[in-house]
Amino acid sequence: TPEVWVQVRMEATELSSFTIRCGFLGSGSISLVTVSWGGPNGAGGTTLAVLHPERGIRQWAPARQARWETQSSISLILEGSGASSPCANTTFCCKFASFPEGSWEACGSLPPSSDPGLSAPPTPAPILRADL
């Protein structure tokens, strides 16, 4: 069964800057990744970035840099300033559309006890939705 993992980290140098990393553990080819915050995409969440493996990357403030890390994982740096900046308990979600598995989404937030610059190792987060 495919899984999605989400890792959220606060940067030690900039306390209002977050790095979100997401990955897809499955055999299918990824056709699209959508990163949102405040809840799952399409369920009250706000889209931060949409990444297509070949067509390109779209991102919106406060997203600063979205990129593919590997063929099955992405990272997104958020720059916090003002009303649109994330806070420590913000939920971030990643939705991977894959063929032939379908769509798989998981969410994560900053570990409550984590110090700036530290985070738990990336582990599969609970899968919220699997649209087959």
């Epitope: 959508t34 399409g42 949409v50 067509r55 390109g56 779209r58 919106w60 990129r67 890390e69 063929q71």
Partner: antibody, heavy 114, light 113 residues
Framework: QVQLQQSGAELTKPGASVKISCKAT????????IDWIKQRPGHGLAWIGE????????NYNEKFKGKATFTADTSSNTAYMHLSSLTSEDSAVYYC???????WGQGTLVTVSA | DIVMTQSPSSLSVSAGEKVTMSCKSS????????????LAWYQQKPGQPPKLLMY???TRESGVPDRFTGSGSGTDFTLTISSVQAEDLAVYYC?????????FGAGTKLELK
């Protein structure tokens, strides 16, 4: 199938403003950004910016900040571009596009003339 | 901003001929993470909107004839038409799909000899 239908040609005077519409059909409107592109004869294609209709998130090309403003109405699946303080330099064909420029509207000709 | 430079600005060809056109970017369009080049090619005929031909530098958009081939990596890219047909006469644009703003090249005009 995906279609983008733009509003008709506009003839306007210098200093005035116009609002161009782009109605999307055939896909989930809020999922993908709508791009706006300007084309003047001999000037090629210039990306003005984009709007993600779901949350009205926008990105503007610095060259068009203050000139163009994007809005979107998810109830009618329509994106809008407002162009202000028009001059002859704004006379051009304006296109809307979506899904990484895979789909395009037919274009709207804006003519600014005294 | 990334600047896209296309050459030549125009090409005169005969039907059946093989043609190549070049596109150079001022910065690399290669995403090292997934080894994909974020470059697109478009074809525009008079009075029509541009039509997407290629994305990812070498992936043909659905419905595009296989006589169109995209190649290249990093900063140097090429669009090749193996055997030009009359309906291929148009202006061809390349575009940076790597970073904002997604700038277009000035175009290469394909004309009949």
């Amino acid at each position: 199938q995906v279609q983008l239908q733009q509003s008709g040609a506009e003839l306007t005077k210098p200093g005035a403003s116009v609002k161009i519409s782009c109605k999307a059909t055939g896909y989930t409107f809020s999922t993908f950004a709508i791009d706006w592109i300007k084309q003047r004869p001999g000037h090629g294609l210039a990306w003005i910016g984009e709007i993600l209709p779901g949350g009205n998130n926008t990105n503007y090309n610095e060259k068009f900040k203050g000139k163009a403003t994007f809005t979107a109405d998810t109830s009618s699946n329509t994106a809008y571009m407002h162009l202000s303080s028009l001059t002859s330099e704004d006379s051009a064909v304006y296109y809307c596009s979506t899904y990484w420029f895979a789909y395009w509207g037919q274009g709207t000709l804006v003519t600014v003339s005294a | 901003d990334i600047v896209m430079t296309q050459s030549p600005s125009s090409l005169s060809v005969s039907a059946g001929e093989k043609v190549t056109m070049s596109c150079k970017s001022s910065q690399s369009l290669l995403n090292s993470g997934n080894q994909k080049n974020y470059l697109a090619w478009y074809q525009q005929k008079p009075g029509q909107p541009p039509k997407l031909l290629m994305y990812g530098a070498s992936t043909r958009e659905s419905g595009v004839p296989d006589r169109f081939t995209g190649s290249g990596s990093g900063t140097d890219f090429t669009l090749t038409i193996s055997s030009v047909q009359a309906e291929d006469l148009a202006v061809y644009y390349c575009q940076n799909a790597h970073s904002y703003p997604p700038a277009f090249g000035a175009g290469t005009k394909l004309e009949l000899k």
